[in-house]
Structures are given as structure tokens and as C-alpha cells.
Interface confidence: low
Amino acid sequence: EPPTACREKQYLINSQCCSLCQPGQKLVSDCTEFTETECLPCSESEFLDTWNRETRCHQHKYCDPNLGLRVQQKGTSETDTICTCEEGLHCMSESCESCVPHRSCLPGFGVKQIATGVSDTICEPCPVGFFSNVSSAFEKCRPWTSCETKDLVVQQAGTNKTDVVCGPQDRQR
């Protein structure tokens, strides 16, 4: 009696169970009563990542350098290529079809989290007691200089963009 279901890694065709092709190979011809399933390896630029009965392999993803992408992991006959962004760039969207430059934190803001290939720089305002006088994608807010520890006094108050200015103590008291 012909089978109605097949074992794992098999498929039903013409009332019989045929072996699926292993990852990295595509189907050339179904099995028959007398012959096994015929499979062929995917070509260099293609892959199949599951046990399958596909007659065509899938093309590897193209990491388009025009859009700031580079190959993070080269595809094999069983895996797709993984793209990432070039140094200094991060993915513009979840699907990562293009990359854009990391944002710099303006003076008065410091880097809370440095950008990665998939996320942009996160900036935060410098709180009281801290400052940033540069536009940077790496620099955190820096603490104001402590004049007291240098035996000096504050001559000019600091802001979120400028350090305090220290000066000598007034000796005429």
C-alpha cells in the first residue's frame, strides 16, 4: 500500500517516499522505484540552508559597498552571506540594506553609548559638574576640574560646554 506520510528528511511524491537533498545541495531528479533522489551541490555563489527539494539554490546576499556594506561572514553552500557596515557606519534600518555615518554628540552632550554596526551613537546632555567642548562620536562628558585639589579657586564657573577656570587663591584676606 502506498505511504501517506514519510519519515523525517523524506518527502512524498508519486506515492513513494524520497530522500530530501541535504543542506548545500539542490534537487536534480526525484527518486523512483529503482533510483535514489539525485542532488547536486550549489554553485559557489549560492546556498540552501535546509534539507530540501528545491530545484534552484538561493543566491548569496550581496553586500553592496556603494551603500556602505561589507561582508562580515562569507556565505557557504549551506549559509547565506552576512553583511555588516563599514567602520564608522551603522545600519540605517532593521533590514540593513544601507549604512550611514555614526552621529557625533555636539558640545554640551557626551557619548552615552558608542555606535555599533547596527545602532547609532546615543548622546546624553552633560549634567551639572560635567562638560564636553567637542563634537565627537566617542567622547563622554568630562568632569569639571577640581580647583580645590590643586590648591586653587574657581575663577570662572563651568558650563555644560566649558570647564571651570581655576586661579590662585587671594592671599590678601
Epitope: Q59, K61, N66, L67, S98
Partner: antibody, heavy 120, light 107 residues
Amino acid sequence: QVQLVQSGAEVKKPGASVKVSCKASVYSFTGYTVNWVRQAPGQRLEWMGLINPYNGGTSYNQKFKGRVTLTIDKSASTAYMELSSLRSEDTAVYYCASSPYSNPYAMDYWGQGTLVTVSS
Amino acid sequence: EIVMTQSPATLSVSPGERATLSCKASQNVHTRVAWYQQKPGQAPRLLIYLASDRRTGIPARFSGSGSGTEFTLTISSLQSEDFAVYYCLQHWTYPLTFGQGTKVEIK
């Protein structure tokens, strides 16, 4: 909303070259990619290539085997497509289409099209 | 190159009816498919991108579905302004390729 305005219709002889311009209404083109697509009479749309104004990078449809050159003038927010060694089968409407950089191939905004007629 | 095949070539539908357009890719293009509408003498207009995302300003009667090699554009209730030619585009790999188009005409 980006608006793209293309140069006017052209009539060319076989073997000549044509250069079509595409001016964007945005101040800076660099948040967009610019694709060029053509459509011969009664035919499907055909992608010719793409230029990324951010870094000047280009990708071409190999069908055109070096006959197409895409360039950009960022200061004028204008993209150009030059097609050389024209033949009668190049008679078509040529479109520029730009896409936001987040989805660079979607071809969100289109020019009105430029008819190029190649005839001896 | 990846070949995109659309069916049917022509679809005759009455206003208010549902229209279902098919697009098949010759190999896996994941969800990297866009749909365009083109009227005579006009440039194409983007309707759907990434297989199912509707472009801002496109009416909700337009919807896209599918992944891999089979994609569908559905117009739930055809309006008079929807009679046009519809093209699918794959942007999984270069060269980007369009289908040959489906003409939606008044029955």
C-alpha cells in the same frame, strides 16, 4: 517630498551619445540613492543602474556593458545618466527614481521621464 | 539574473470587485519585492515595498503579501482610478528586475 525634474526629449542618431539630467528639489541629495530605469514602447521597466550620492558609488546592469555612466553634481542636486553607442533599440522613456537611504532600492520618487528617440 | 513573472497578463474586473495579481521570482528573493502602478503617459508610482509595507499615502485597499518566490498584490475593492498596469520589482540582488506587468482593465 522629493520632486525630480528631468531634461527634455532628445532625438539622436545611431552611434551617438545622450546625457539625461535629473534635478532634485531637495537641498541635499545625500539621504537618497538615485536609480535609472528605462521603458521601451510597450515593454516592461528595465533597471539600468544606481548611484549613491553620499559616496559617488555606482552599480550598473551588466546588460549595458559599459555604455552607461551615472554621475552626480551634489552642489546642484542633479544626477546624470549618459548612454553611449546608441542603437535603435535604445529608443525608450528614461526615468530617474530616488529612494530614501533607509530603503535604497524602493524607488519612491520618480522623474517625469525623458523620451530618447534613436533614428537615422 | 532573477526573472520575475507576473500573471495574469490582463485582468478584467468590475469596479468594486477584488483583484489579485501574482508575481513569481525565479529564485528566492526573500521579502525584497516592491509593487508599482503605472498609468499611460505617467511614471510608475510605488505602492508596496518589502513585500507588504504600504507606502505612505497609498489607500488601504492595496495590500501585498508573500516571501521567497511567490508574491501577491491585492486590491480589495477596485476604484475607477485603479485601472492601470502593475509591475513587481525584485531588489534582492543586482541587476534589479521587474515583472512584465499585469494590466487591470474594466470588465
